[in-house]
């Protein structure tokens, strides 16, 4: 069955935008004015996931690119990456678990918990121009809260 999807940008709670840093990495930095056009546009899709109150399973693709955020083990550590997919087969309702994030939405703030690695979240650093990563702590130095902005076509 088809599912709903939307186009959006994400900013962390310090208002840092997400931009491409090389072909397979995102970084977070403050943007202003025309530079805002650099920020990544996500295609966020509802997907099938495990049931849990106030968690909504989504996949985060890069709009009009065959790239999805995914969570894998690298050197025994949960790691966030951009993964190429076959555009003929994606997006789909039953995404592989590494592509699934549990969206937690409270007071217009969003968190994205890895379905593959519970309690690991899409995170940014306090510092400018650093990679977006998968972090295993919430409420510490690293930022796990985001806001979403619909993209007008």
């Amino acid at each position: 069955a088809p599912v709903r999807s939307l186009n959006c940008t994400l900013r962390d709670s310090q208002q840092k935008s997400l931009v491409m840093s090389g072909p397979y990495e995102l970084k977070a930095l403050h943007l202003q004015g025309q530079d805002m056009e650099q920020q990544v546009v996500f295609s966020m899709s509802f997907v099938q996931g495990e049931e849990s109150n106030d968690k909504i399973p989504v996949a985060l693709g890069l709009k009009e690119k065959n790239l999805y955020l995914s969570c894998v083990l690298k050197d025994d550590k949960p790691t966030l990456q951009l993964e190429s997919v076959d555009p003929k087969n994606y997006p789909k309702k039953k995404m592989e678990k590494r592509f699934v994030f549990n969206k937690i939405e409270i007071n217009n703030k969003l968190e994205f918990e890895s379905a593959q690695f519970p309690n690991w979240y899409i995170s940014t650093s306090q510092a400018e121009n650093m990679p977006v990563f998968l972090g295993g702590t919430k409420g510490g130095q690293d930022i796990t809260d985001f806001t979403m902005q619909f993209v007008s076509s």
């Epitope: 069955a1 088809p2 599912v3 709903r4 999807s5 939307l6 186009n7 959006c8 966020m44 899709s45 509802f46 997907v47 099938q48 049931e51 109150n53 106030d54 909504i56 989504v58 969206k103 939405e105 217009n108 806001t147 979403m148 902005q149 619909f150 993209v151 007008s152 076509s153």
Partner: antibody
Framework: EVQLVESGGGNVQPGGSLRLSCTAS????????MAWVRQAPGKGLEWVGI???????YYASWAKGRFTISRDNSKNTVYLQMNSLRAEDTATYYC?????????????WGQGTLVTVSS | EIVMTQSPSTLSASVGDRVTITCQAS??????LSWYQQKPGKAPKLLIY???TLASGVPSRFSGSGSGTEFTLTISSLQPDDFATYYC??????????FGQGTKLTV
């Protein structure tokens, strides 16, 4: 106070068109998913459609082609454009905000606006 | 498209009664099921989402259960304010959203 107010309802002849508005106060509509739901007199609730960004709209099968949802974030307003109206479109039309993106449930509703299609 | 079927269509009960309304989905919707209460001339009010989670401000006498295709709404002890029409609705991010036909709860 957080609320939604619908307007634009009224009498229209079969085959005519009408545009309903839903204006938010107390919050910004710009990043809210907004749906329209209708209710014919004495009948049950019927989902019309939902809008996320302006390119991401979804409709009930019966509404596709005749009904269009759009938004104007600068006016904090969502619209329902209804064309080729029929007697069976007579209903109270509600706008509602999705509780969370893709939750598919609606925690905030307007008071509704009545559309009557009759010659 | 998913079809939601409620039973009964009408239900007579008294203050203090325990009442149960059932909702059946034509295909599995996991736990993506919501319940609403509507009073005459008013907009619907969200009672329960994700099959069993109470919406903000809803009294604890309301409860929901079920998953897959079979769901129930229970009011443990009816209060005068509870006489209304109740609707189930499949939720989540599927393209199609549908409401049940409603259950009118009368004195």
């Amino acid at each position: 106070e957080v609320q939604l107010v619908e307007s634009g309802g009224g009498n229209v002849q079969p085959g005519g068109s009408l545009r309903l508005s839903c204006t938010a106060s107390g919050f910004s509509l710009s990043n809210s998913a907004m749906a329209w739901v209708r209710q014919a007199p004495g009948k049950g609730l019927e989902w019309v459609g939902i809008i996320y960004d302006s390119a991401s709209t979804y409709y009930a099968s019966w509404a596709k082609g005749r009904f269009t949802i759009s938004r104007d974030n600068s006016k904090n307003t969502v619209y329902l454009q209804m064309n080729s109206l029929r007697a069976e479109d007579t209903a109270t039309y509600y706008c509602a905000r999705e509780r969370a993106i893709f939750s598919g449930d609606f925690a905030l509703w307007g008071q509704g606006t009545l559309v009557t299609v009759s010659s | 498209e998913i079809v939601m079927t409620q039973s009964p269509s009408t239900l007579s009960a008294s203050v203090g009664d325990r009442v149960t309304i059932t909702c059946q989905a034509s295909q599995s919707i996991s736990s993506w099921l919501s319940w609403y209460q509507q009073k005459p001339g008013k907009a619907p009010k969200l009672l329960i989402y994700k099959a069993s989670t109470l919406a903000s401000g809803v009294p604890s006498r309301f409860s929901g259960s079920g998953s897959g295709t079979e769901f129930t709404l229970t009011i443990s002890s009816l209060q005068p304010d509870d006489f209304a029409t109740y609707y189930c609705q499949n939720a989540g991010g599927g393209v199609s959203i549908a409401f049940g036909q409603g259950t009118k709860l009368t004195v």
